[in-house]
Interface confidence: medium
């Protein structure tokens, strides 16, 4: 069964800066990745970035840099400042659309005991929805 993992890390140099890494553990080809915060996109969550393997990347503040790490994983750097900055208990969600598996989504947040610059290892997060 395909899985999605989410890792959230606070940068040591900038306490309001976060890095979100997401990956898809499956055999299909990725057609789209959506990263949101506050919950899934359209269900109380706000889209931060949309990544398509061929058509490019769209991102919105406070997202600073979204990029592909591998064919099945992405990273997103958030730059926090003012009202739009993330906080330690913010939930981030990643949705991977894959052919032929369908859509798989998981969410994660900063581990409660995390020190700046540290993060939990990227483990598969609970899958919230499979379309």
């Amino acid at each position: 069964t395909p899985e999605v993992w989410v890792q959230v890390r606070m940068e040591a140099t900038e306490l309001s800066s976060f890095t979100i890494r997401c990956g898809f553990l499956g055999s299909g080809s990725i057609s789209l990745v959506t990263v949101s915060w506050g919950g899934p996109n359209g269900a109380g969550g706000t889209t931060l970035a949309v990544l398509h393997p061929e058509r490019g990347i769209r991102q919105w503040a406070p997202a600073r840099q979204a990029r592909w790490e591998t064919q099945s994983s992405i990273s997103l750097i958030l730059e926090g400042s003012g009202a739009s900055s993330p906080c330690a208990n913010t939930t981030f969600c990643c949705k991977f659309a894959s052919f032929p598996e369908g859509s798989w989504e998981a969410c994660g947040s900063l581990p409660p005991s995390s020190d700046p610059g540290l993060s939990a290892p990227p483990t598969p997060a609970p899958i919230l929805r499979a379309d």
Partner: nanobody, 127 residues
């Protein structure tokens, strides 16, 4: 809940121009749909897809409006626009804004999966 609000309709003479706008809003969060599209329904007729634009800027048009209508969107403002030129009497209709998501980020054919709709704005082309 997501709301779509259209504006810009009105009465225009044949050959004239209008610009429709649609703003997507939601309570408590920002909704950024993969696809936003315009549909229309002429008096006594069925719903017709006019144009669509996806989050990457890819556009599709109905044959009846190609070369006359231009769809665009402002992702930062969650707004959708339809510039209508060289209007004809047969363009008279209620124009609806629709939004939704799709598996690959593109606008699905015939509006499948566009689960949010506006109330519509009336466009009348008459001399």
């Amino acid at each position: 809940e997501v709301q779509l609000v259209e504006s810009g309709g009105g009465l225009v003479q044949p050959g004239g121009s209008l610009r429709l706008s649609c703003v997507a809003s939601a309570s408590g969060f920002t909704y950024r749909p993969y696809c936003m599209a315009w549909f229309r329904q002429a008096p006594g007729k069925g719903l017709e897809a006019v144009a669509g634009i996806d989050i990457f800027g890819g556009t599709t048009y109905a044959d009846s409006v190609k070369g006359r209508f231009t769809i665009s969107r402002d992702n930062a403002k969650n707004s959708l626009y339809l510039q209508m030129n060289s209007l004809r009497a047969e363009d008279t209709a209620v124009y609806y804004c629709a939004a939704g998501d799709s598996p690959d980020g593109r606008c699905p054919p015939l509006g499948q999966g566009l689960n949010y709709w506006g109330q519509g704005t009336m466009v009348t082309v008459s001399s």
